[in-house]
Amino acid sequence: AESCTSRPHITVVEGEPFYLKHCSCSLAHEIETTTKSWYKSSGSQEHVELNPRSSSRIALHDCVLEFWPVELNDTGSYFFQMKNYTQKWKLNVIRRNKHSCFTERQVTSKIVEVKKFFQITCENSYYQTLVNSTSLYKNCKKLLLENNKNPTIKKNAEFEDQGYYSCVHFLHHNGKLFNITKTFNITIVEDRSNIVPVLLGPKLNHVAVELGKNVRLNCSALLNEEDVIYWMFGEENGSDPNIHEEKEMRIMTPEGKWHASKVLRIENIGESNLNVLYNCTVASTGGTDTKSFILVRKADMADIPGHVFTR
């Protein structure tokens, strides 16, 4: 059975069949014996009771108020009342876009990752028995699909699949033809699965420095949005007033990952800063990666093989 209309604010497009179904419908035994009333209020009118005589477009069934079709002047507040149960909806009927097969304000957006399963199925359970045929359109061009009851696309997503997909259900009611349109804006994005974060460059770096001068140690990593990059040094971080961690810089890559950079600035280099490990670590749920920097006095450079130097 079709679920009830629980959303209190509803926007619909003029000219389409539409229904409101109250949420106490499961109390079937009560429904039979209890007085039930539907009301509308809008602007000037307060609580006008609705019945099929109010409009040839309105139909009342057990739990449902139907519009054949809904029109702009149906905008307003609707109430269902039964015993001590009341349900209220605010209905906003908007103009149809006559220059397109869909109305932009009535589009459902979906993001699909490339190469992931992508599916569009045209279904409408409430009007199912009245639907003669259904067509699926992409960017307002009809897809020539064989199943004209429930047209379906099932595939692995490609970037070319991006676009507006409109399911149009054609149905007859009291000798008139109606259609109901449901449109999806499909955006195809790069694979967003997590990478194992990695620090760029050699794992051990010897940096030639002069006492009394300043040095900037740059730590760069390719990581996921939620991963962290940080420096570790000395017995206790923050004990040396000459060492400063600069603000982390992040740039998003075209693949949706992040290139992060964090600089450790050491001012007025002293003996205590030499030959100790300054570790930069990137951490994620998948593990950690660390690279180390060692400051070496320029005079001692000759003792270290050239390939381990970072200038």
């Epitope: 992409k138 960017n139 307002c140 061009k141 009809k142 897809l143 020539l144 699909l145 064989e146 199943n147 004209n148 696309i153 595939k155 070319e160």
Partner: nanobody
Framework: EVQLVESGGGLVQPGGSLRLSCAAA?????????IGWFRQAPGKAREGVSC????????YYAGSVKGRFTISRDNAKNTVYLQMNSLKPEDTAVYYC?????????????????RGQGTQVTVSS
């Protein structure tokens, strides 16, 4: 209402080549359709020649054309092609394209709901 339009047919000598195109008419798109090429010669039954899946990854050829005909598609151009090489007089027929019944490109593929008017291919010296 015509949804598919074939072109590229004509008169060709035996051993010659032709390239047939099957395009969607204005307001339609072939992008998710499995498409087949069929042919019918005067006084003969309709025959399935070749078909291609919507992705272009699955193709099938009837035994009589295998190795001579190649089916391909360009979804950006909304067109399916049938490249016909080493043509023989027995290839003479009206060729038309159609969506596939059952949505499958296999050795039993059959014409579906949407089809074109056809294009004449005549192989004669």
């Amino acid at each position: 209402e015509v949804q598919l339009v074939e072109s590229g047919g004509g008169l060709v000598q035996p051993g010659g080549s032709l390239r047939l195109s099957c395009a969607a008419a204005s307001g339609f798109t072939l992008v998710y359709s499995n498409i087949g090429w069929f042919r019918q010669a005067p006084g003969k039954a309709r025959e399935g020649v070749s078909c291609i899946s919507s992705s272009g990854e699955v193709a099938y050829y009837a035994g009589s054309v295998k190795g001579r005909f190649t089916i391909s598609r360009d979804n950006a151009k909304n067109t399916v092609y049938l490249q016909m090489n080493s043509l023989k007089p027995e290839d003479t027929a009206v060729y038309y394209c159609a969506t596939l019944q059952g949505d499958v490109c296999t050795n039993t593929f059959m014409s579906g709901s949407y089809r074109g008017q056809g294009t004449q291919v005549t192989v004669s010296s």
